[in-house]
């Protein structure tokens, strides 16, 4: 079977604050089983953005159903976005373990720029 | 529901230490941010300490940094505040608050603990 | 740092009329504003965040509104237990996260 990639085909984007973020996520293999999760930042100090089993994540939308058996896209939607929220987001492939899940691979990040509204 | 109980208050010396818990229970602990936040007798709200979901990332005000220390277990879902080389400006009730999402208000408070500082 | 200033400190409220309460920040914090209310010797509790949405199970008496730098917690009819500190928290800079001083609502 096919190793499995994880694309974060954005390297930047820009976003008024205010307003919703698209971060771009796609992998290419369904295998190994275990959850999608989305950091802000690396290492030890990273924020949970999003994790497909745990919530809720009441400013995270999904873009497709992620609750399908075959979905290879886990790109999220950030609503209102502060400049707080400038940084690289990172899109996290885990493999199901016992007790914890461990971490698989990481997407390359893409870097959220916020732009301030005009006053 | 969502419940958090904090512990571990009382009454010691100038210079002393003393450690607060925060026992959480009815959310998904370790998806999200925990703050501490103080109330000095009869004044306002002022933020202590954050610490992001995983543990690894920790914020301070000026007035703590370098004397509290912010940590968490998340497989006990507990939360908990080091306080060494207390001062007398440091007696307050100290409520542990629940952070929306990783970049959010507070949404849910503990009940608090007192911690006296007097010789 | 962005600095938030309640005012007014105390306002005296007759059962059943309005109450006005503003909060100001020193730069723009966009819609991210937050009110909670500490009734004596309780915990504070959230009522209202991104400046005008209601926390769950909050009566419909309690509104916010506001963006910016101006914002207002209102009271539509006053009742007797919602005699408390209310504060406001912002949360588009941080750290720090920063409240304001609090305003005491009293009952008339």
């Known amino acids: 079977e096919e190793e499995l990639q994880i694309i974060q085909p954005d390297k930047s984007v820009l976003v008024a604050a205010g307003e919703t973020a698209t971060l771009r996520c796609t992998i290419t293999s369904l295998f190994p089983v275990g959850p999608i999760q989305w950091f802000r930042g690396a290492g030890p100090g990273r924020e949970l953005i999003y994790n497909q089993r745990e919530g809720p994540f009441p400013r995270v939308t999904t873009v497709s159903d992620t609750t399908k058996r075959n979905n290879m896209d886990f790109s999220i939607r950030i609503g209102a976005i502060t400049p707080a929220d400038a940084g690289t987001y990172y899109c996290v492939k885990f493999r199901k373990g016992s007790p914890d899940d461990v971490e698989f691979k990481s997407g390359a990040g893409t870097e959220l720029s916020v732009r301030a509204k005009p006053s | 529901d969502v419940q958090l109980v904090e512990s571990g208050g009382g009454v010691v010396r100038p210079g002393e230490s003393l450690r607060l818990s925060c026992a959480a229970s009815?959310?998904?602990?370790?998806?999200?941010?925990m703050n501490w936040v103080r109330q000095a007798p009869g004044e306002g709200l002022e933020w202590v300490s954050r610490?992001?979901?995983?543990?690894?990332?920790?914020d301070y005000a000026e007035s703590v940094k370098g004397r509290f220390t912010i940590s968490r277990d998340n497989s006990e879902n507990t939360l908990y505040l080091q306080m060494n080389s207390l001062r007398a400006e440091d007696t307050a009730v100290y409520y542990c608050?629940?952070?929306?999402?990783?970049?959010?208000?507070?949404?849910?408070w503990g009940l608090g603990a007192l911690v006296t500082v007097s010789s | 740092e962005t600095v938030l200033t309640q005012s007014p400190a105390t306002l005296s409220v007759s059962p059943g009329e309005r109450a006005t309460l503003s909060c100001r920040a020193s730069?723009?914090?966009?819609?991210?504003l937050a009110w909670h209310q500490q009734k004596p010797g309780q915990a504070p509790r959230l009522l209202i965040y991104d400046a005008s949405r209601r926390a769950t199970g909050i009566p419909d008496r309690f509104s916010g509104s506001g963006s910016g730098t101006d914002f207002t917690l209102t009271i539509s009819s006053l009742q007797t237990e919602d005699s408390a500190v209310y504060y406001c928290?912002?949360?588009?800079?941080?750290?720090?996260?920063?409240f304001g001083g609090g305003t005491k609502v009293e009952i008339k």
């Open positions: 730069q723009t914090v966009g819609s991210k």
């Open positions: 009815g959310f998904s602990f370790s998806s999200y941010a």
């Open positions: 928290q912002q949360y588009y800079y941080w750290p720090p996260y920063r």
């Open positions: 610490i992001n979901s995983g543990g690894g990332g920790t």
């Open positions: 608050a629940k952070q929306y999402d990783w970049n959010g208000f507070f949404d849910y």
